[in-house]
């Protein structure tokens, strides 16, 4: 049994970083492999993640992680049975995707404008918080080539748009997404998309 | 309220033993990792001693080792540390601490300290 | 075991003023680097921790920054109840080792 693709790890840096790799043949990851992971740090504990089936030969393990910092080091050794497969070392801060945005909501009853409100995935105290950027993505459900994507570079998890700038009459989805300058982060997944029909009054024409 | 409330401390002659306690309140402190830091006159500060949540593993500084040991009671939440051999040098207050992590960092709890005075 | 090189060892300055101290450490520590203040006769305080991280409830004046072996910590507009010894700290290596605290003075 061998390591065909050394594990890659991300973490959202906040608990959770998941590490996926491929072995060279067919495997049943949780009952033939674990992947063992410690902190740097002394007295740290090690931890034991029992990895799943990702395609045939895939696996993927989800690391459990308290309270991550950019201090943050981790030893990875992957074993199976007694046989050591690899070792390596992950630093959480160097390989970060945040946790997608929730509960984005279109706001239609502002005059002519449309609010679309999000949720910031991160706690107050978590580094992240205050960090993101975010990118919203709305479409036609009528019309491939009508997709527009609007670059939220500001703190506050919202985007307020001129309806008229949307086609009157048909239905729009929206969908939005993270990322973090302060780490070089990977964009976050699209959050669940949400619909609305969108409808505005046409001005009158001056003559 | 957060309190770290150390005793135990005192003269004691060279070659004296001590036993430090610490009495803590207003964490969980069965799941804490904690440690001993001391400051001695014109020194820097030193980690002396940390334990695990679970008293399992310990660590303990060079200056320090087979001399002194720290313990604790999740029981009665309290941490100890007993010090035997004592030296002049050991001469400090020391500082119950609270790790802020599962493993030695930051501390972000600290008593008010106990002197410890080794003199003849 | 890792050199903490505080500096400056003291230093005055006036209410109002930013105030910088630096610490260098003899080997890369990663961000495992650690502020504290200590006031007359009182125990440390966590300040900052993981180079760059404000602890809870700690006033915002209060900053650090830096990674491998160059560490600053910062107070933006120094006010009167400031006046401490702060020391960094280092947890990369082994044993943890402290730098020997800038005594700040208000003039």
């Known amino acids: 049994m061998k390591v065909l693709q050394e594990p890659t790890c991300v973490s959202d840096y906040m608990s959770i970083s998941t590490c996926e790799w491929k072995m060279n043949g067919p495997t049943n990851c949780s009952t033939e492999l674990r992947l063992l992971y410690q902190l740097v740090f002394l007295l740290s504990e090690a931890h034991t993640c029992i990895p799943e089936n990702n395609g045939g030969a895939g696996c993927v393990c989800h690391l459990l992680m308290d309270d991550v910092v950019s201090a943050d080091n981790y030893t990875l050794d992957l074993w199976a049975g007694q046989q050591l497969l690899w070792k390596g070392s992950f630093k959480p801060s160097e390989h970060v995707k945040p946790r997608a945005p929730g509960n984005l909501t279109v706001h239609t009853n502002v005059s002519d404008t449309l609010l679309l409100t999000w949720s910031n995935p991160y706690p107050p105290d978590n580094y992240l918080y205050n960090h993101l950027t975010y990118a919203v993505n709305i479409w036609s459900e009528n019309d491939p080539a009508d997709f527009r994507i609007y670059n939220v570079t500001y703190l506050e998890p919202s985007l307020r748009i001129a309806a008229s700038t949307l086609k009157s009459g048909i239905s729009y989805r929206a969908r939005v997404r993270a990322w973090a300058q302060c780490y070089n982060t990977t964009w976050s997944e699209w959050s669940p998309s949400t619909k609305w029909h969108n409808s505005y009054r046409e001005p009158f024409e001056q003559h | 309220e957060v309190q770290l409330v150390e005793s135990g401390g005192g003269l004691v002659q060279p070659g004296g033993s001590l036993r430090l306690s610490c009495a803590a309140s207003?964490?969980?402190?069965?799941?804490?990792?904690m440690s001993w830091v001391r400051q001695a006159p014109g020194k820097r500060l030193e980690l002396v001693a940390a334990i695990n949540s679970n008293g399992g593993k310990t660590y303990y500084a060079d200056s320090v080792k087979g001399r002194f040991t720290i313990s604790r009671d999740n029981s009665k939440n309290t941490l100890y540390l007993q010090m035997s051999s004592l030296r002049a040098e050991d001469t400090a207050v020391y500082y119950c601490?609270?790790?802020?992590?599962?493993?030695?960092?930051?501390?972000?709890?600290w008593g008010q300290g106990t002197s410890v005075t080794v003199s003849s | 075991d890792i050199q903490m090189t505080q500096s400056p060892s003291s230093l005055s300055a006036s209410v109002g003023d930013r105030v910088t101290i630096t610490c260098q450490a003899s080997?890369?520590?990663?961000?495992?680097v650690v502020w504290y203040q200590q006031k007359p006769g009182k125990s440390p305080k966590l300040l900052i921790y993981s180079a760059s991280y404000l602890y809870t409830g700690v006033p915002s004046r209060f900053s650090g920054s830096g990674s491998g072996t160059d560490f600053t910590f910062t107070i933006s507009s120094l006010q009167p109840e400031d006046i401490a010894t702060y020391y960094c700290h280092q947890y990369y290596g082994s044993p943890p080792t402290f730098g020997g605290g800038t005594k700040l003075e208000i003039k």
């Open positions: 601490t609270r790790q802020r992590g599962n493993y030695v960092g930051a501390m972000d709890y």
């Open positions: 080997q890369d520590v990663s961000t495992a």
């Open positions: 207003g964490f969980t402190f069965s799941s804490s990792y």
